[in-house]
């Protein structure tokens, strides 16, 4: 009897949908695997007789529930199927946005770039897919624990009237208010403000 694949899970980030599993212990030899998806009542092969322990399902529609399955094979024998269901628009992880930061005197000017849909070669981003898309920004003085959060209205934001000659760190994530779903934070960007431009009277 061939044992089934173990720890079968979907690793999906920005709609790059990779089904992953682990090969079970099997004394007779090396196992191969076949992964399929359900398409209108019929299971279709996506990865056949592969020695890999992952299969790319990024071509599936972003909308609706999908049933995927994988089994292990050896010679003419095979394991039972292991099934999972997956809804990309609900389940995909929202990766970190890009962010450009520029210092102008005692202000930080930030521009945000929504993460690209990873399986496409054009300019569609996660912001296109999710109507309620917004950004959360958090910032703090470098070396301190207190963090401040803001929700910009647009793809840019300005933090004004900061302390001069002070390093501030900023990071951003995507947020979907209608789903109460947050994406991953970007890596912090730390910049030092310069002088206060206000002229004394």
């Amino acid at each position: 009897m061939v044992p089934p694949p173990e720890n079968v899970r979907m690793n999906s980030v920005n709609f790059k949908n990779i089904l992953q599993w682990e090969s079970p212990a099997f004394a007779k030899g090396n196992l191969t695997f076949t992964a399929q998806y359900l398409s209108y009542r019929i299971f279709q092969d996506k990865c056949m007789n592969t020695t890999l322990t992952e299969c790319d399902f990024s071509s599936l529609s972003k909308y609706g529930d999908h049933t995927l399955r994988v089994r292990a094979e050896f010679a003419d024998e095979h394991s039972d199927w292991v099934n999972i269901t997956f809804c990309p628009v609900d389940d995909t992880i929202i990766g970190p946005p890009g962010m450009q930061v520029e210092v102008l005197a005692d202000s930080l000017h930030m521009r945000f770039l929504a993460p690209k849909i990873e399986n496409e070669y054009e300019t569609w981003t996660m912001k296109n897919v999710y109507n309620s898309w917004t950004y959360n920004v958090q910032y703090w003085k470098n070396g301190t624990d207190e963090k401040f959060q803001i929700t910009p209205q647009y793809d840019f934001e300005v933090l004004r009237n900061l302390e001069p000659w002070t390093t501030y760190c900023v990071q951003v994530r995507g947020f979907l208010p209608d789903r109460n779903k947050a994406g991953e934070w970007s890596e912090p960007v730390c910049e030092q403000t310069t002088h206060d431009e206000t002229v004394p009277s």
Epitope: Y37, L38, S59, G64, W124, N128, V129
Partner: nanobody, 126 residues
């Protein structure tokens, strides 16, 4: 919400022509992949023709040279021009859309399209 509405089906003699249309609301054709599928009685739904956001097209072998898929982004309408129709083309024809898809690879599977119309019947018979 995306809605697709097919029209243009009907009864036609072998060798005749039909033009199917698919009007969309809540969606712009320039932003994704579109396709025509068909389902004959007792058979599975199958891909007929697809068109990507860049205008590139793919056809099932059984319709190559006879069918042409096109879209009018200004009218938000997808078309399927069907010439030299054969009895085996008889089926319910469905329009499908997958928003924010560039067509990095051909999509031929039902599971690769998220939105569907109700279908329009095409019957080829003498």
């Amino acid at each position: 919400q995306v809605q697709l509405q097919e029209s243009g089906g009907g009864l036609v003699q072998p060798g005749g022509s039909l033009r199917l249309s698919c009007a969309a609301s809540g969606y712009t054709y320039s932003s994704g992949c579109m396709g025509w599928f068909r389902q004959a009685p007792g058979k599975e739904r199958e891909g007929v023709a697809t068109i990507n956001s860049d205008g590139s097209t793919n056809y099932a072998d059984s319709v190559k040279g006879r069918f042409t898929i096109s879209k009018d982004n200004a009218k938000n309408t997808l078309y399927l021009q069907m010439n030299s129709l054969k009895p085996e083309d008889t089926a319910m024809y469905y329009c499908a859309a997958e928003p924010y898809c560039s067509g990095g690879y051909p999509r031929w599977s039902v599971a690769e399209f998220g939105y569907w119309g109700q279908g329009t019947q095409v019957t080829v018979s003498s």
